[in-house]
């Protein structure tokens, strides 16, 4: 299984797609955990809702969201407020019983502001003012469902 | 309030086509997945496809997959069936339904009744 | 497929009694079970999710319990309006199955 190399700014969030079939993985949760070392266990960050049938619901571990569109077989995890020991080395996972089946690895690589680099010594500042406008970057984004549980009649 | 409104049923013969209509208002009709579930004459519920709120994912029960086409146009706020090939045992009452991604029905149209009769 | 088998077909009760209806399911599917009511001319209507969660606006008096493969819906005293047929649907296999119907009736 390949590994998506992702990065985020600090500060920011960073949201990561896993595709799966759909229909394979019909009726499994989904779960986003960190792997603890190269051979190590992967640690349960967050999975999505206990009840399989909520799983398009947003569900929340400190700043890691996660959602799942089942039909369109796309799992989303967003990070916020991405920080330096977010780095590292991370997989979606689908439930079925005790058993993880890895959907993807994903390493996540955190990018540090230069201007928040206090021992950046010198900065260059150009003679003329210019306008600087930072490009904030959503990998992989998907579209979440848009509802209010439960259902409004 | 949530509204659906079928449309497009009626007499049709073995073999003949049909092109059911649901129009949907009350709520952001591209965010959600739609649903098309019949019933037959005295009979219970079957679920017959589903679409995803993008149009990117369609799904179908194997009784009617290669005849019948789930379609979508949001900027329209409608969903399609287009039935080909029909049968007697198309005959029933189809429904389209708003719901989650995980085929829970929330909102029910009122219904469009199919007939195949020679 | 997976098979859902209410019980019983007919169910006959009088206004303001108790009703208790049942859905097995041929396989386990945890708490993701739906319940609908459908009245005579009507689109269903969607009462319960998650095995036991009551969709917005419908009365307190509808309860669902059970979890795997036995479930039941409750009706703690029935109103006029709630003679109709009811359906369990579960979601966790592919492709959604319901049950045959429990129709309830006057007695």
């Known amino acids: 299984l390949n590994t998506t190399v992702l990065q985020g700014m600090a500060g920011q969030s960073l949201r990561v797609s896993c595709t799966y079939d759909a229909l394979k993985h019909w009726g499994r949760r989904k779960a986003w955990c960190r792997q603890l070392g190269e051979e190590g266990p992967c640690q349960r960050v967050v999975s999505t809702h206990g009840v399989w049938l909520l799983a398009f619901l947003k569900k929340r571990n400190g700043s890691t969201v996660i959602a799942d569109d089942t039909l369109a077989g796309t799992v989303t995890i967003t990070l916020k407020n991405l920080q330096a020991g977010d780095a590292g080395l991370y997989q979606c996972q689908s439930l079925r019983g005790r058993e993880a089946e890895v959907l993807q690895k994903v390493l996540v690589e955190v990018l540090e502001d230069p201007l928040d680099d206090q021992d950046a010594g010198d900065l260059w500042v150009p003679e003329e003012s210019s306008s600087f406008e930072g490009a904030q970057v959503e990998h992989s984004t998907s579209r979440n469902q848009e509802t209010s549980f439960p259902p409004t009649s | 309030e949530v509204q659906l409104l079928e449309s497009g049923g009626g007499l049709v013969q073995p073999g003949g086509s049909l092109r059911l209509s649901c129009a949907a208002s009350?709520?952001?009709?591209?965010?959600?997945?739609m649903s098309w579930v019949r019933q037959a004459p005295g009979k219970g519920l079957e679920w017959v496809s589903v679409?995803?709120?993008?149009?990117?994912?369609?799904y179908y029960a194997d009784s009617v997959k290669g005849r019948f086409t789930i379609s979508r146009d949001n900027s329209k706020n409608t969903l399609y069936l287009q039935m080909n090939s029909l049968r007697a045992e198309d005959t029933a009452v189809y429904y389209c339904?708003?719901?989650?991604?995980?085929?829970?029905?929330?909102?029910w149209g009122q219904g469009t009744l199919v007939t195949v009769s020679s | 497929e997976i098979v859902m088998t209410q019980s019983p077909a007919t169910l006959s009760v009088s206004p303001g009694e108790r009703a208790t209806l049942s859905c097995r399911a041929s396989?386990?599917?945890?708490?993701?079970l739906a319940w609908y009511q459908q009245k005579p001319g009507q689109a269903p209507r969607l009462l319960i999710y998650?095995?036991?969660t009551r969709a917005t606006g419908i009365p307190a008096r509808f309860s669902g319990s059970g979890s795997g493969t036995e479930f039941t819906l409750t009706i703690s005293s029935l109103q006029s309006e709630d003679f109709a047929v009811y359906y369990c649907?579960?979601?966790?296999?592919?492709?959604?199955?319901f049950g045959g119907g429990t129709k309830v009736e006057i007695k």
């Open positions: 649907q579960q979601l966790p296999y592919w492709p959604p199955t």
């Open positions: 679409i995803s709120g993008s149009g990117g994912s369609t």
């Open positions: 339904a708003k719901g989650t991604p995980t085929l829970l029905f929330q909102h």
């Open positions: 396989q386990s599917v945890s708490s993701n």
């Open positions: 998650g095995a036991s």
């Open positions: 009350g709520f952001t009709f591209s965010s959600y997945a």
